[in-house]
């Protein structure tokens, strides 16, 4: 079943390459058990950058290596991805799946346009 | 680059079955909207089937409702169209397509294709 997911349309990265936005899906029931990932589209591709899953109240748990970090509250998870260069510029998108209780839905957000822009290295100094 | 692969085609008596397949190579099929298009000879293309980015919706022509079924492999990055019942009028060569939207459309087939498969000729006779 579908379900709707609102995120900002566009988010500039701030100049440690971290970007953060707000993910909010319309829950149509009581889920207990979500997961959250986050895709990247980008060249006629979709990749996943990182997902979560997470029990409702709870904080969310990615992968020890992911870049992604996040905290959840009510219908609202909270996203940060770390470590972003200029070539990761691109439409980063929510999707989210309530797992539990039945019935599943999934819902995809529109995306959010991160960009990054590369740090002017410093100049020497004498 | 994403190159669409068509295979599974063949000589199949009428009433028969035949499971056909498109395949991505260079990239994945992830979220795309995938159609099969097919033409016999002296005829126009048409669609024949199309399913959703989600894998949520899917279309068919009036001529090949309750016979054939498209579906999503993405565990082997394939669109399966599984054709069941044919007809000789089925006879033509296939064509997959393929098109990624933009997320707001994922739910949906898209109008038109970016990317065409090089056709897979199926023959229905006895």
């Known amino acids: 079943k579908a379900m709707h997911v609102a995120q900002p349309a566009v988010v500039l990265a701030n100049s440690r390459g971290t970007a953060s936005f707000v993910c909010e899906y319309a829950s149509p029931g009581k889920a207990t058990e979500v997961r959250v990932t986050v895709l990247r589209q980008a060249d006629s591709q979709v990749t996943e950058v990182c997902a979560a899953t997470y029990m409702m109240g709870n904080e969310l748990t990615f992968l020890d290596d992911s870049i992604c970090t996040g905290t959840s509250s009510g219908n609202q998870v909270n996203l940060t991805i770390q470590g972003l260069r200029a070539m990761d510029t691109g439409l980063y998108i929510c999707k989210v799946e309530l797992m539990y209780p039945p019935p599943y839905y999934m819902g995809i957000g529109n995306g959010t346009q991160i960009y990054v822009i590369d740090p002017e290295p410093c100049p020497d100094s004498d | 680059e994403v190159q669409l692969v068509e295979s599974g085609g063949g000589l199949v008596q009428p009433g028969g079955s035949l499971r056909l397949s498109c395949a991505a190579s260079g990239g994945t099929l992830d979220y795309w909207s995938i159609g099969w298009f097919r033409q016999a000879p002296g005829k126009e293309r048409e669609e024949v089937s199309c399913i959703s980015g989600t894998g949520l919706r899917t279309n068919y022509a009036d001529s090949v409702k309750g016979r054939f079924t498209i579906s999503r492999d993405n565990s082997k990055n394939t669109v399966i169209l599984q054709m069941n019942s044919l007809r000789a009028e089925d006879t033509a060569v296939y064509y997959c397509?393929?098109?990624?939207?933009?997320?707001?459309?994922?739910?949906?087939?898209?109008?038109?294709?970016?990317?065409w498969g090089q056709g897979t000729q199926v023959t229905v006779s006895s």
């Open positions: 397509t393929g098109k990624l939207l933009h997320p707001s459309l994922w739910s949906a087939c898209a109008n038109e294709y970016d990317l």
